[in-house]
Interface confidence: medium
């Protein structure tokens, strides 16, 4: 699997989408897990409703929510009040029995440009910062990792 990068702004919300083949994964619950190290296990964060037919219902674990459009084939994860410690490698998974298939590998990046709270592009006139209520899900972008970029750089 290629790794897709999703970028969100610190303190705001980030939506991650994981498309999948709805026929191939029919009847399967889904999960969102965090990769612990390059070769470590993927620690479950949140999973869809126990009853597959109710997968469209949003389930929360702390500040992370999951919902599944089983007909359209899109799993959506929302990370609310994004913090620096949320940055890292995650997986969208399709569950069957005790097994899990990886739907998408996701690298979450938490961005923090100090100009983002100023008036648009104008460095010299500070503006009011948007509150979470003003914008429920803020700007997010996704891309594939650049060649040579690694999700787990060597630690010094």
């Amino acid at each position: 699997h290629n790794t897709t990068v999703f970028q969100g702004v610190a303190g705001q919300s980030l939506q991650v989408s994981c498309p999948y083949d709805s026929m191939k994964h029919w009847g399967r619950r889904k999960a969102w897990c965090r990769q612990l190290g390059e070769k470590g296990p993927c620690q479950r964060v949140v999973s869809t409703h126990n009853l597959w037919l109710l997968s469209f219902l949003r389930r929360w674990n702390g500040s992370t929510a999951i919902t599944d459009d089983t007909l359209g084939g899109t799993l959506t994860i929302t990370l609310r009040n994004l913090q620096p410690h949320d940055a890292g490698l995650y997986q969208c998974q399709s569950l069957h029995g005790s097994e899990a298939d990886t739907l998408r590998k996701v690298l979450v990046e938490v961005l923090a440009d100090p100009l983002d709270h100023r008036d648009a592009g104008d460095l010299w006139f500070p503006g009011e910062s948007e509150s979470f209520e003003d914008a429920h899900v803020e700007h997010s972008i996704s891309r594939s990792l650049l060649e040579g970029e690694i999700p787990f750089p060597p630690t010094s």
């Epitope: 970028q7 303190g11 938490v110 961005l111 923090a112 100090p114 009011e128 700007h139 997010s140 970029e149």
Partner: antibody, heavy 115, light 112 residues
């Protein structure tokens, strides 16, 4: 005229505490995100901590090297930002700047941690 | 962390000549809304850093237009078209895209 004046720097023994104060004037303090940046002699600046505005619930962020030891806070009514430094180490020795990390910088206050 | 490297670490320039300083990041600094979060500072001897360039190529207020910034996602250049005596000091690149914010090691500019 914009002013940021840092005070509270001194010579202190390892393991002790120190509180830095940054008094500001001349700009809309309550809207501005503020940071502490430090610089050891002949080294490049190092970002230490960051506090956002009231509209961002005064969210705080820290460098790993100071997390759990340093606390950044602000008092909008006094246009001041603070850095409470506990369990100081010799490697914390530096000039500490109060700044919005963009256009506003103080002159710095020297913190020396030595036995 | 996002690591910035600068080259050269020291440069000696004749007044009136141009100078270029390069900064390289180990990660892309292209963020949301196509904003590249790379900043350039000059720190004059005994002074606080002062902002020259913000978001890769925007000249900060009061900075002479002989300074210019350019680059891509990971490679950046600060150019001084005609160096003057007041330009002496240490030039730092910095990234404010990800926590922790990080600065480059600096490039010392001296006059010949």
């Amino acid at each position: 005229e914009v002013q940021l004046v840092e005070t509270g720097g001194s010579l202190v023994q390892p393991g002790k505490s120190l509180r830095l104060t940054c008094a500001t004037s001349g700009f809309p303090f309550s809207n501005v995100w503020l940071h502490w940046v430090r610089q050891s002699p002949e080294k490049h600046p190092e970002w230490v901590a960051h506090i956002k505005a009231k509209s961002d619930n005064y969210a705080t962020y820290y460098a790993e090297s100071v997390k759990g030891r340093f606390t950044i806070s602000r008092d909008d009514s006094k246009s001041s930002v603070f850095l409470q430094m506990n369990s100081l180490k010799e490697e914390d020795t530096a000039i500490y700047y109060c700044t919005d990390i963009l256009e506003y910088w103080g002159q710095g206050t020297l913190v020396t941690v030595s036995s | 962390d996002t690591v910035l490297t600068q080259a050269p670490l020291s440069v000696s320039v004749t007044p009136g000549e141009s100078a270029s300083i390069s900064c390289r990041s180990n990660k892309s600094l292209l963020g949301i809304r196509d904003i590249t979060s790379l900043y350039w500072y000059l720190q004059k001897p005994g002074k606080s850093p002062q902002l020259l360039i913000y978001r890769m190529s925007n000249l900060a207020s009061g900075v002479p237009d002989r300074f210019s910034g350019s680059g891509s996602e990971t490679d950046f250049t600060l150019k001084i078209s005609e160096v003057e005596t007041e330009d002496v000091g240490v030039y730092y690149c910095a990234q404010f895209l990800r926590y922790p914010y990080t600065f480059g090691p600096g490039t010392k500019l001296e006059l010949k």
